[in-house]
Structures are given as C-alpha cells and as structure tokens.
C-alpha cells in the first residue's frame, strides 16, 4: 500500500476520489476525511511472505503487526473484508512468532461492539509473543510443478501446474492470458483490453483447460466488468494492468485455483527464479499454441534492463524484466496478460503480468512484465469498490 500520493508532499496522503491531500495523522483515525471515505478503509494490509496482518496507526503514522492476544476468526474475516475479499473466500488465520517486533496493535476487548479499528490501540508489549497471520483466500497452491519447457519453442504444461492461468477469448479466439486472484477476479494486461476490446461483453474466460480445442461456447465464463488501470499509457505500456470481473464465480478445484497477490515487504532478488505460462506463439510471428506452455525465467535487475544495450531506459518502476539476456526463452504474442510467478515459502506469487518485448526470445531483448507489486493497492481498491 503506497501512501505517498503523487500530488501530495512527502508527508501527505492523497484521496483517490478527489485528489485532495490529507495529513497522515488523519488516516485511519475513525473519521472520514476523504469524500469517498477511503482514508478509513485502507487501514489494513498483509505483510511479507507470511501474511502478517498489519494495521496503520494514525498516532505513529506507520504500520504495525496485530498482537494475537484476544484475536479471533471474526476479526480476521473483517480485516479480509476490508481489504476487498469476500467473506466466503476466507481461508485461515495463523500465528507467527513476533520476530522481534517492538510495536504492536492490540485489541481492547472492553471497547464494546464497535468497528474493529476502534478496538485496536497501540502497545509496546504483546503477552502472547505472537502476531496474527491472515490468509484471506487459499491461494498459490498448485498440483504439479511443470517440467522445464518454453513458451517459445517448448513443451506443454502439466495439468494443475498453473491452475490460476486463464485463456481470454474474443469471438471464440484466444486473445490474451490472465491470472485468477479470487473466484470472481482475473488480472490481465491493460493492452489486452484497449479499444475496441474494452467492453466486457466481448470477453469469455476459460479456466482449468489446457488445450484451446477444448474451449468452446458454454464452457467459458462471461466477463461482467473490465477495469483498465487509469494511468495506463498505450505508447510506453506503463501501468499495463487490468482487471476482469466474471459474471459468475469460478468453482475452485485441482485445476482451477487462485495465485497469491504479492504482499508489501516481499523482496525480489535479481536472478530470482520465476515461471511464465501461456498459449502464445511458440516462435516469433507464429500462431497461438494449441496447448498451454510454461517456462523458467530469471528476473533481470531494472538497472541492467534499462542499460543502453537492452531497453535503454524504457523500463519504469511499474515494469519488471524477466528472461535470459542470451535469448531462447521468452513469452510471445498471445501470452500477454498471463502470469509471471515465483515460489516463496511453498506459495506461488503473481509477480508480473506479461506486457511487452522487442520480438520474442531475442538476445538482449527479455520479456517485460507489469510489476504487480506496484498495483496491489489499486487491485484491492477495485475489489473493495465492487463490494
């Protein structure tokens, strides 16, 4: 969650609805200062790969973990709801060693039947020595890890290996990939839904099916809403992310499952191992693949990707590069919008959405992906706004 609004000074926080700036001490203080009330509904986040629940303290103007003392499932559900997840998505809550935290938010159980955040107070002690970890949705679990393969020139993925992968069709033709993040929401790329494809009735999503020939009218899910990032730039492909809301929720099973959105505090390493998947062309200027393919790629530091011999400063903070500078393995046309994922703590995280590249699998021209970490705040806001 980024509270440094672009229009506000370093100490100010921007209201989404009006663009006005408010003081951080007014954020999450129990009183609405933004016209849309968003200063009071963005007060909770999950932090790091262990999903540690953190609440914003208006007194301290910073985030703090929630002490396990007196905490229960109902509070957990409320916190997930405030992030934008529906009650029926709720997965579980756990307890994590406080790992040296010195500052906590604690429940005041005598506060009566009031809003959860009004029950929380700042404390330097936590008697249980444990903080709340929250899973708002059972995400990031797959069946098989795919064998080594490539999207350009490679082999097929195994069933259940990438259960969050969807194929997005227009007029019965695969156009883009996407990633399931809840039963109703798909992450894809904004460039996939540029005009004239910005109207939702053109789109159908297919989940849990590996072969394009098995995707036919009736097996797909109609799209009800298409939300493109408001700051998407079609020329530079900056902020290349979009959401699709499905008309009916997906039914999760071994072949259809959500991927986890990354949490703040998750550090990506240069050369971190990731995977890409999709039905894109298996060679440059080739046709869409009949089968789902997947490939191992490595993250490439932005500084390196922005060097003169690679993309020469075209990479923004809202982008991530992945692949190999020697080429050979890459996403290609038709993979757009699909996932770039990485595994941490045995959980698969959506790090990027396939965005652009110069050709496919060329040396010094790696794949460029939307940096999902930068967009999680925006994603949760859309989910919340939709109720």
């Amino acid at each position: 969650w980024k509270f440094m609004g672009s229009k506000c000074s370093n100490s100010g926080i921007e209201c989404d609805s009006s663009g006005t700036c408010i003081n951080p001490s007014n954020w999450c203080d129990g009183v609405s200062h933004c016209p849309g009330g968003e200063d009071e509904n963005r007060c909770v986040r999950l932090y790091g790969p262990n999903f540690i629940l953190q609440v914003y303290s208006s007194q301290r103007k910073s985030w703090h973990p929630v002490c396990q003392d007196d905490w229960n499932e109902n509070y957990g559900r409320a916190a997930c709801r405030d992030m934008g997840y529906k009650n029926n998505f709720y997965s579980s809550q756990g307890i994590v060693d406080d790992s040296g935290s010195t500052s906590f938010m604690k429940l005041n159980t005598s506060a009566g039947n009031v809003d959860i955040y009004k029950k929380l107070y700042h404390s330097d002690a936590c008697s249980s020595k444990a903080v709340v970890s929250l899973r708002c949705i059972a995400c990031g679990v797959n069946l098989n890890s795919s064998r080594q393969s490539r999207i350009v020139g490679g082999e097929s993925a195994l069933p259940g290996a990438w259960p969050w992968q969807v194929s997005l069709h227009v007029q019965n033709v695969h156009v883009c990939g996407g990633s399931i993040i809840t039963p109703e929401w798909i992450v894809t790329a904004a460039h996939c839904v540029e005009k004239p494809l910005n109207n939702p009735w053109h789109w159908t999503a297919f989940a849990g099916i590996l072969r394009q020939s098995f995707m036919f009218y009736g097996a797909g899910y109609q799209v009800e809403k298409v939300i493109s990032h408001p700051n998407y730039d079609s020329k530079t492909k900056n902020n290349d992310i979009a959401l699709m809301k499905l008309q009916k929720p997906l039914t999760f099973n071994d072949l259809v499952k959500p991927v986890c959105l990354p949490n703040p505090g998750m550090m990506l390493q240069p050369e971190q191992l990731c995977w890409i998947s999709g039905w894109g062309a298996t060679e440059e200027k080739g046709k869409t693949s009949e089968v789902l393919n997947a490939a191992k790629v490595l993250l490439i530091e932005t500084q390196r990707c922005n060097s003169r011999y690679v993309y020469d400063n075209l990479i923004t903070p809202a982008m991530i590069c992945a692949g190999f500078l020697q080429g050979n393995v890459d996403s290609c046309q038709g993979d757009s919008g699909g996932p770039l994922v990485t595994s941490k703590n045995n959980i698969w995280w959506l790090i990027g959405d396939t965005s652009w590249g110069s050709g496919c699998a060329k040396a010094y021209r790696p794949g460029v992906y939307g940096n999902v970490m930068v967009f999680t705040d925006w994603i949760y806001r859309q989910m919340r706004a939709d109720g």
Epitope: Q171, K195, P196, L197, N198, N199, W201, Y217
Partner: antibody, heavy 118, light 109 residues
C-alpha cells in the same frame, strides 16, 4: 461529430445478393465495433452481428449465419454488409450502429432500405 | 433464443415520471445482460440512451436513468417532456448475441 452514412436504397431480384455500406467519420474507425441491425416492418429490431474493424473479427446471430457477411475497409473507414440469397423476408431497413464505451448501439446510421422484388 | 418483452405502449403527461421495463424470458435481468436502451424518434433516427444497465450516454439529459428493478431492466424518465415522445427499445446480451425487445411507444400528451 460521429457520423455513420449508409448507402442508398436497393431494389434487387429474389435469389440475388446486395452489399450495403456504412461510412464512418468523426472518430477513429478502428476504435469501436460496428453492429448491424435489421428493422422489421412494424417496429421490432434484430441484431445481425458485429465486426471488429481492427482485425475483421466477426460475431453473428445464429439466424443470420450464411445470410449476412460483414467486412470492413480500414482505408476508407467503411463497414459493409453483404446479404445473399435474398427473399421477400429480407425486404426491410438495415442499420449500422457503432459501439461506445459500455454502449453496444451508441450511434446509428440513417438506415438502408432493401426491396426484394421480381 | 431468449425473448425480450416490453410494454407495447405507455402514455404520460409532461412533467410526470414514467418507467418502461424490459423482461427476459429466461429469468432475471442482471448486470451481465448489459441492458441498454435506444430511442427512435418519429423520423427513424435512433440514439443510444443508456448502456450497461445504468450508464447514460454523453449528451443524454439527466431525466433519463436506467436501473434493474426486481427481475427486469427499467428506463425511468423523470419529468417527461413532449420531445420524449418516441419508441424506446431495450436490448439484452445473452452470452454471445444481443436480443432486442419489441419496443415501447411512449406518448407524451
């Protein structure tokens, strides 16, 4: 200002074909799907199909598959509908209608009357 | 194929509020039917009014509003004017095709 200018009335013989046009102006032609609609005598409307002017991709109402063929010419910003094997049932007014954002039928042409007569 | 039903005719007076409805033969009209309303003036000129249930087209007066009421889509004209006399068609999306209603002839007396 968005304008859709359709071709003039057509008198054709039964069994023949006709191609009617819809010239678009006042917007970027490839930015919006074009729909075609049949106006029955009296007042009902029937959706024939639509076309993506960007790539020529089409969707048809099952009822009009084999009857109507939709095409575009990007260079002249014109959408076309060809109707074949015409019968008296096809003697009606046909409209092109451009999509808008969240609007399938935002802007309409003035209509083209096709009369099928021996 | 689904059938979309509208009132065949309605009469209202200037300044009154009138509601036109649009029903689907295969169940409740939902946001996923992207209900939209088109106006046909007597000179056979068509104009898109409302898209995706409740979005007013640019330039359409605020007295026109769209909604979903019960199991139907509705077009409400709050404070009808004589120039609103027209035929109003609704169209609903059914997975891969649009279906129009028969149209409602609105008379403003």
């Amino acid at each position: 200002e968005v304008q859709l200018q359709q071709s003039g009335p057509e008198l054709v013989k039964p069994g023949a074909s006709v191609k009617i046009s819809c010239k678009a102006s006042g917007y970027t032609f490839t930015d919006y799907y074009m729909n075609w609609v049949k106006r029955r005598h009296g007042k009902s409307l029937e959706w024939i199909g639509n076309i993506n002017p960007n790539n020529g991709g089409t969707s048809y109402n099952q009822k009009f598959k084999g009857k109507a063929t939709l095409t575009v010419d990007k260079s002249s910003s014109t959408a076309y509908m060809e109707l074949r094997s015409l019968t008296s049932e096809d003697s009606v007014v046909y409209y092109c209608a451009r999509e808008g954002d969240l609007f399938p039928f935002a802007y309409w042409g003035q209509g083209t009357l096709v009369t099928v007569s021996a | 194929q689904a059938v979309v039903t509208q009132e065949s005719a309605l009469t209202t007076s200037p300044g009154e509020t009138v509601t036109l409805t649009c029903r689907s033969s295969i169940g409740t009209v939902t946001t996923s039917n992207f209900a939209n309303w088109v106006q046909e003036k007597p000179d056979h000129l068509f104009t898109g009014l409302i898209g995706a249930s409740n979005n007013r087209a640019p330039g359409v007066p605020a007295r026109f509003s769209g909604s979903l009421i019960g199991d139907k889509a509705a077009l409400t004209i709050t404070g009808a004017q004589t120039e609103d006399e027209a035929i109003y068609f609704c169209a609903l999306w059914f997975s891969n095709h649009w279906v129009f209603g028969g149209g409602t002839k609105l008379t403003v007396l």
